[in-house]
Amino acid sequence: QDTPALGKDTVAVSGKWYLKAMTADQEVPEKPDSVTPMILKAQKGGNLEAKITMLTNGQCQNITVVLHKTSEPGKYTAYEGQRVVFIQPSPVRDHYILYCEGELHGRQIRMAKLLGRDPEQSQEALEDFREFSRAKGLNQEILELAQSETCSPGGQ
């Protein structure tokens, strides 16, 4: 089965995305209380830079990661190859599923995230994400994330 292609250009996924939901195949140690929009920026050579800020335990955590393009459409590597990331379109317009597998805090983990251009939750996209997660054996509860344009430590 072919991985649905994003096209030759990563521009399709560039810009501002809201992280709507996430799940994993095991308990994630620190669940965010809220998240700022994720900014995906296309770089030379087809790589992507991802930036997001998460409010966890009252602390703002800024995350920047470069997703390195591979020869397979929609497939990237991160953290010096320790993580493999797939970005694929959802059947619901303006939504993508980000699926990654690799190391987190010294253990192997598989996670999926639902991204949307709009802060409002789409039930169609969420249900497709639920089915995707089931198929991938990601049996943790799906966490729907609170959105915040900026991160304020100690509050939302």
Epitope: P4, P89, P91, D128, G137
Partner: nanobody, 112 residues
Framework: QLQLVESGGGLVQPGGSLRLSCVGS????????MGWYRQAPGKEREWVAS????????NYADSVKGRFTISRDNAKRMVYLQMNNLKSEDTAVYYC?????WGKGTQVTVSS
């Protein structure tokens, strides 16, 4: 108009086999993860199997593992459920699901 139509149900003896089919229209089929669910008389609807859009990864409820196989054919916009070694407890209406849409279901009865 998004539509899911199941077929292939019927009456089968214990130990027998059936292949259910579901055709989807009105959405980008290849991008949708698909699922089969079932509802036995007087019981809640339960998850049976799912197949992902990304790489056709599959996962099954413990009660059907090793007996049922879910597959898909994106060119035909079809998802299948091959059911082998059927048991009386598999008797139910089987539903296909995409996103938050459901088909009308197909009846499977396992009885001697």
């Amino acid at each position: 108009q998004l539509q899911l139509v199941e077929s292939g149900g019927g009456l089968v003896q214990p130990g027998g086999s059936l292949r259910l089919s579901c055709v989807g229209s009105g959405f980008t089929f290849s991008l949708a993860s698909m699922g089969w669910y079932r509802q036995a008389p007087g019981k809640e609807r339960e998850w049976v199997a799912s197949i992902s859009s990304l790489d056709a990864s599959t996962n099954y409820a413990d009660s059907v593992k090793g007996r049922f196989t879910i597959s898909r054919d994106n060119a035909k916009r079809m998802v299948y459920l091959q059911m082998n070694n059927l048991k009386s407890e598999d008797t139910a209406v089987y539903y296909c699901k995409a996103m938050n849409y459901w088909g009308k279901g197909t009846q499977v009865t396992v009885s001697s």
